[in-house]
């Protein structure tokens, strides 16, 4: 009696579904009463299928509602374990243990990947220095290196920083920033780089004509501008008020003047 595995290594994506398989010999019709199938991962019990019955009482809580033995495959000599919504914690060494007349077991290694596919980007400008801050943020696993390049795909020099934290699902939340001197329509790329082929993801950042967002320093800039505008409005109001006062004084002093004199005065006032 021999259990075989078509694959002993599975690399699966976070959040996807996986089916791992162990084959065992079945002659003619399957005798469920003689069959025992266990699936375990390290010290966690996933499946206990004994004499045609699955015992969910002993199933580890982390696999509840997510793991099932594909019963329709048993008659084909295939003990297939399906796990839905794969978590990072599902990575490890699995054992299928089958007793059917004789007994045997095999090990299967599962690795879980989470590509840094969805890259969020932000561009801001420092008015004081005219320096642009480019920011790329993404979630994935395992650790990725963030590489910044220009439109010629050459590495960019500039002040950079990276922060990494964990999400609730244990993914890595990686944020990388780059401070550069750039002009409108310059193109930059941030690449979340992993050594495995096909695991690199890139976002394109184009420097806008006007800054896409304003950093906190711009607030003082607007306050200053607002203050100047307010000052100008106050000054204009005072001047208008003074003009009215001057006109009233002229009328009181001179009484009725000839037309040419009045026109002259109006012109002078309007030009002030």
């Amino acid at each position: 009696f021999t259990v075989t595995v078509p694959k002993d290594l599975y690399v699966v994506e976070y959040g996807s579904n996986m089916t791992i398989e162990c084959k065992f010999p079945v002659e003619k019709q399957l005798d469920l009463a003689a069959l025992i199938v266990y699936w375990e991962m390290e010290d966690k019990n996933i499946i206990q299928f004994v004499h045609g019955e699955e015992d969910l009482k002993v199933q580890h809580s982390s696999y509840r509602q997510r793991a099932r033995l594909l019963k329709d495959q048993l008659s084909l000599g295939n003990a297939a374990l399906q796990i839905t919504d794969v978590k990072l914690q599902d990575a490890g060494v699995y054992r299928c243990m089958i007793s059917y007349g004789g007994a045997d077991y095999k090990r299967i290694t599962v690795k879980v990947n989470a590509p840094y596919r969805k890259i969020n980007q932000r561009i801001s400008v420092d008015p004081a220095t005219s320096e642009h801050e480019l920011i790329c943020q993404a979630e994935g696993y395992p650790e990725a290196e963030v590489i910044w390049t220009n439109s010629d795909h050459q590495p960019v020099s500039g002040k950079r920083s990276v922060t990494t934290s964990r999400t609730e699902g244990m993914l890595l939340n990686v944020t990388s920033s780059l401070r550069v001197n750039a002009t409108a329509n310059d193109v930059f790329y941030c690449t979340f780089w992993r050594s495995q082929p096909g695991q690199n993801h890139t976002a394109e950042l184009i420097i806008p004509e006007l800054p896409a967002t304003h950093p906190p320093q711009n607030r003082t800039h607007w306050v200053l501008l607002g203050s100047i505008l307010l000052f100008l409005i106050v000054v204009s109001t005072v001047l208008l008020f003074l003009r009215k006062q001057v006109r009233m004084l002229d009328v009181e002093k001179c009484g009725v003047e000839d037309t040419s004199s009045k026109n002259r005065n109006d012109t002078q006032f309007e030009e002030t």
Epitope: E42, N45, G102, Y105
Partner: antibody, heavy 118, light 113 residues
Framework: EVQLRESGPSLVRPSQTLSLTCSVT????????WNWIRKFPGNELESMGY???????YYNPSLKSRISITRDTSKSQFYLQLSSVTAEDTATYYC????????????WGQGTLVTVSA | DIVMSQSPSSLPVSVGEKVTMSCKSS????????????LAWYQQKPGQSPKLLIY???TRESGVPDRFTGSGSGTDFTLTISSVQAEDLSVYYC?????????FGSGTKLEIK
């Protein structure tokens, strides 16, 4: 060195439930398979079932509807319950540890004689 | 279930004598994963629990004297004691761990002539 010790009543009434405890020292439940085996008065040995380090259980089909093996890792104990006993269940009951799923019984308790009688 | 048959049930011997006892299984116990036979021998002295002597049909458990030798393959197995000592007077059981449930032979009792 792993040591196992069985304890429980030596006399059980017919139709009642036989309950035994196996206390483990020198090892934890993080590995191995923890078995119950019995030896009948005629010297015949029978493997009854096990509970594994992962909590999975196996019961001999001849006992399936009557047997339950559980554990309490915090107390380093595992338990046997055998319901609806008859005189045929009179035996010396042993707890034993095997290193893996398809390995023999490397460590045994000293055994406890249980008699089923009215 | 795999049936294990042991013979003889009783074996009268003298100290210093060489003895052999037989164990047969109802199906082959050759485990394909390591090409070894899933058979163990136990010794049970009066008033004591069984003690593992031999596993994989021929591998001695640590601390077991080398006068105990296990042999055989497939369905036929033998336990040999090259020179019986007084402390060897016990019941010897063979057991298969090839498939569940694990099953034992009925035992061979080694007695003084």
């Amino acid at each position: 060195e792993v040591q196992l010790r069985e304890s429980g009543p030596s006399l059980v009434r017919p139709s009642q439930t036989l309950s035994l405890t196996c206390s483990v020292t020198g090892d934890s439940f993080t590995s191995g398979y923890w078995n119950w085996i019995r030896k009948f008065p005629g010297n015949e040995l029978e493997s009854m079932g096990y509970i594994s380090y992962s909590g999975s259980t196996y019961y001999n089909p001849s006992l399936k509807s009557r047997i339950s093996i559980t554990r309490d890792t915090s107390k380093s104990q595992f338990y046997l319950q055998l319901s609806s006993v008859t005189a045929e269940d009179t035996a010396t009951y042993y707890c034993a540890r095997s290193e893996g799923w398809l390995l023999p019984f490397a460590y045994w308790g000293q055994g406890t004689l249980v008699t089923v009688s009215a | 279930d795999i049936v294990m048959s042991q013979s003889p049930s009783s074996l009268p011997v003298s100290v210093g004598e060489k003895v052999t006892m037989s164990c047969k299984s109802s199906q082959s116990l050759l485990y394909s994963s390591n090409q070894k036979n899933s058979l163990a021998w136990y010794q049970q002295k009066p008033g004591q629990s069984p003690k593992l002597l031999i596993y994989w049909a021929s591998t001695r458990e640590s601390g077991v004297p080398d006068r105990f030798t296990g042999s055989g393959s497939g369905t036929d197995f033998t336990l040999t004691i090259s020179s019986v000592q007084a402390e060897d007077l016990s019941v010897y059981y063979c057991q298969q761990y090839y498939g569940y449930p694990f099953t034992f032979g009925s035992g061979t009792k080694l007695e003084i002539k």
